[in-house]
């Protein structure tokens, strides 16, 4: 149903039935003995989407997910029994839920699962070349998964595998109390965050991990973790959640006398995503749900997109906030949070900060220390007691780029595509929800790049039954979006241009960067094809200018088009 209305009303709202009828969705409805299709790994080179699920790992063809291979990786009956004996649910907990699926090298993936509350990891052979058609479990090589996968399938792991080392934020114990950021695998001793210290991590829920270079020197590379956690006592009145960004240096090998095999460069800062509310009290979106990094020409400065929801049960809302890495770095170079005063409240640390500044990576760029093991004792002592920054990271423009508060759903996932249109580049967001719908939203700059207008292009129901979308990937090569849920997978093209209507005006008014009027129909826009007959106006959506004569066929038709 085509609707040309306010920005918060989708131009196109498509039910699951309409998506099927227009060949706009391909679904994989899961296997009878599996579920939880939550762990995605996109391989554009091989044209595969690897998916970790309950007791299975899948390799889907990106062209059509109906074409797939599968590995069955259940737990032994003995592990299942032990899990059951521990009072866990045989279906929902006493199975192997795959939580980590990463490229290990050119020929293998690394996978970890909950192993029925007994985390386990192994390698998956995928061959040298796509045509090898190899997809098999290395069942002679199992490894302990503690500190890599959680025990409990309800928990997530944020992980990153680089240079043969696995960085993971997860729960490292049966009870789900010992949360930590680990580095395992590789040749070095495993490293983790300080244990039983709520200043470091306070019952966190990890979202994702990313390597972001700090300079042209790879020694300065940092790994950033995104998570949400309980606010530390005194930081907030009452129990509250805070969204966080944490950093660690890739070349952190722990301390020498103190913080041995613990991170010495761990710092965290709060991510703010809020709107001014009545009575001068801001409405905060604190429950970070997902993060997407949009790479720019400068690899040091990707744009961070975050999806947030409210903590309140009374007021349900979702928001998308954008952050710049320069703002993040500014906060990490700012004052540390310190407890002081009669009420032992958090204040900016005013004293002498030891040299080299805690959080700085040991390298030639920022000082003469070759290793964190060489750091002076006062640096280590300070780092141990000051893991948090005082200043929060505010979003670009100090406000969300999109908010939804008057709807019966919440945002869960986000992926973003940078699209070349006739009148410039646009970021198109695909936002997954907890009811199985995907929103397609375009950010349109107004006067300045920082001032954005959000246009909700489409709202698509991609699963038959309402089900939370728990994973999303976008293939720029295939021009397809993939969504995972407890029940299965959905694949959809990034555009449905024909659905906007059969007139130039409707196509133009849609303001979809993927679509343009080609003289006969609203069809996919290819930037390379510089045909004079392509009508498109994303910035203004003005059909009068673009659809009048000038070689453009098609009648001016302002009537809404219904299917």
């Amino acid at each position: 149903n085509y609707q040309n209305g306010k920005n918060n009303v989708p131009r196109l709202k498509l039910s699951y039935k309409e998506m099927l009828e227009s060949n706009s969705v391909i679904t994989f409805n899961g296997l009878a003995n599996s579920s939880s299709y939550h762990t995605f790994l996109l391989d554009e080179e091989r044209s595969r989407l690897y998916v970790g699920a309950k007791d299975h790992i899948f390799s889907f063809n990106l062209v059509n997910i109906k074409d797939f291979q599968k590995i069955v990786w259940p737990v032994s009956y003995t592990r299942r029994d032990e899990c059951k004996w521990a009072g866990k649910d045989i279906q929902k907990e006493c199975a192997n839920f795959i939580k980590v699926l990463k490229a290990y090298n050119q020929t293998h993936l690394y996978a970890c699962g909950t192993g029925a509350f007994h985390p386990i990891c192994t390698y998956i052979e995928i061959g040298h070349h796509p045509e090898d058609n190899i997809f098999k479990l290395e069942d002679s090589h199992f490894e302990n998964g503690r500190g890599k996968s959680p025990y409990d399938p309800k928990l997530l792991t944020a992980s990153l595998l680089i240079d043969g080392e696995l960085y993971s934020g997860t729960a490292a114990d049966f009870m789900g109390r010992d949360f930590a950021i680990f580095r395992t695998l590789g040749h070095h001793h495993p490293i983790r965050t300080e244990q039983h210290d709520s200043r470091w991590l306070n019952d966190p829920r990890f979202i994702s991990a990313h390597l972001i270079p700090e300079s042209d020197n790879p020694e300065d590379d940092k790994v950033y973790f995104f998570f949400r956690e309980n606010a530390i006592d005194g930081e907030h009145t009452g129990k509250a959640t805070h969204a966080r960004i944490g950093q660690i240096c890739k070349n952190d090998f722990g301390g020498h006398r103190s913080l041995v095999n613990k991170w010495t460069t761990f710092l965290k800062a709060r991510l703010i995503c809020s709107v001014p509310g009545p009575n001068g009290i801001d409405t905060h979106f604190d429950e970070l749900q997902d993060v997407f990094l949009m790479n720019s020409k400068d690899p040091k400065n990707p744009i961070v997109y975050g999806v947030f929801t409210t903590s309140s049960n009374i007021f349900k809302g979702s928001a998308v906030c954008m952050y710049s890495m320069s703002d993040v770095r500014r906060v990490f170079l700012g004052p540390y949070a310190h407890r002081d005063g009669p009420n032992y409240q958090w204040v900016p640390y005013q004293g002498r900060v030891p040299y080299p500044r805690p959080g700085t990576c040991p390298s030639k760029t920022f000082g003469g220390f070759d290793s964190t093991k060489d750091l002076p004792d006062d640096v280590i002592t300070f780092a141990r007691s000051h893991p948090a920054m005082y200043n929060p990271v505010f979003p670009i423009n100090n406000r969300p780029i999109m908010i939804k508060t008057d709807v019966n759903y919440q945002f869960t996932q986000i992926v973003v595509d940078r699209v070349d249109a006739e009148d410039g580049q646009y970021d198109v967001m695909f936002i997954g929800t907890d009811v199985g719908t995907v929103l397609k939203v375009v950010s349109i700059p107004k006067e300045t790049w920082h001032d954005l207008e959000e246009v909700l292009l489409e709202e698509m129901t991609v699963f038959r039954e309402p089900t939370p979308i728990s994973a999303m990937e976008l293939s720029t090569k295939q021009h397809q979006l993939y969504a995972g849920s407890p029940a299965g997978l959905a694949q959809l093209p990034l555009q449905r241009c024909a659905a906007y209507g059969r007139a130039c005006a409707e196509c133009c008014l849609a303001r979809d960067p993927y679509c343009a009027w080609d003289g006969a129909a609203c069809s996919r826009y290819f930037p390379a094809a510089k045909a004079r007959t392509r009508a498109q106006d994303i910035r203004n959506g003005d059909p009068l200018t673009h659809c009048s004569d000038g070689g453009i066929e098609g009648r001016m038709d302002h009537h809404h088009h219904h299917h």
């Epitope: 299942r80 029994d81 032990e82 521990a86 302990n144 114990d173 049966f174």
Partner: antibody, heavy 116, light 111 residues
Framework: EVQLLESGGGLVQTGGSLRLSCAAS????????MSWVRQAPGKGLEWVSW????????YYADSVKGRFTISRDNSKNTLYLQMNSLRAEDTAVYYC?????????WGQGTLVTVSS | QSVLTQPPSASGTPGQRVTISCSGS????????VSWYQQLPGTAPKLLIY???HRPSGVPDRFSGSKSGTSASLAISGLRSEDEADYYC???????????FGGGTKLTVLG
């Protein structure tokens, strides 16, 4: 070859305490749940307690709950049973058993005699 | 009083087939795997059957296990004198959150 060797048994007065140990070898101790099972003289087997491979979960039979504590030290490949407030009915041979969905390996047992 | 019920004794002559029963409820045998243990005189118990009917390596195929509903049974065919021992069935009990054993069956090989 899997081996389980119990020690620490002996004669103790009612109300007294005893700590049993079980040294394990021949398998990756830290990968398996472990258990204690006892057998009173001339009687059948009675499960006492079990502990998860990483100590994350512990279970006890009602007859010993609150008095016995199971623990393990994975770095020493050793299982323990701390027995407090012992009663005459706790007199038995105490076996340490490797748990693998069932008790697939047993030690030879250590005798605990509680006298009044 | 054991949660699982076994006959206190059973007997047979060499070469004969003997069956030992084990009766329980839905919270143990009905919904959980049954194991059988053999205890030779003066020794520790040994696992004989696991997961209702599976034999660990080294256990002769003369021993077999089966389960139906809330009852299980152990069959020994081609009885031999060295089979003389106490036999226990066992299973996890979901409602008790503990492992339960039968009272044991003393098998005597006659003649």
């Amino acid at each position: 070859e899997v081996q389980l060797l119990e020690s620490g048994g002996g004669l103790v007065q009612t109300g007294g305490s005893l700590r049993l140990s079980c040294a394990a070898s021949g398998f990756t101790f830290s990968d398996y749940a472990m258990s204690w099972v006892r057998q009173a003289p001339g009687k059948g087997l009675e499960w006492v307690s079990w502990i998860y491979y990483d100590s994350g979960s512990k279970y006890y039979a009602d007859s010993v709950k609150g008095r016995f504590t199971i623990s393990r030290d994975n770095s020493k490949n050793t299982l323990y049973l701390q027995m407090n407030s012992l009663r005459a009915e706790d007199t038995a041979v105490y076996y340490c058993a490797k748990l693998n969905g069932d008790f697939d390996y047993w030690g030879q047992g250590t005798l605990v005699t509680v006298s009044s | 009083q054991s949660v699982l019920t076994q006959p206190p004794s059973a007997s047979g002559t060499p070469g004969q087939r003997v069956t030992i029963s084990c009766s329980g409820s839905s919270s143990n045998i009905g919904n959980n795997d049954v194991s059988w243990y053999q205890q030779l005189p003066g020794t520790a118990p040994k696992l004989l059957i696991y997961a209702d009917s599976h034999r660990p390596s080294g256990v002769p195929d003369r021993f077999s296990g089966s389960k139906s509903g809330t009852s299980a049974s152990l069959a020994i065919s081609g009885l031999r004198s060295e089979d003389e021992a106490d036999y226990y069935c066992g299973a996890w009990d979901s409602s008790l959150s503990g492992y339960v054993f039968g009272g044991g069956t003393k098998l005597t090989v006659l003649g």
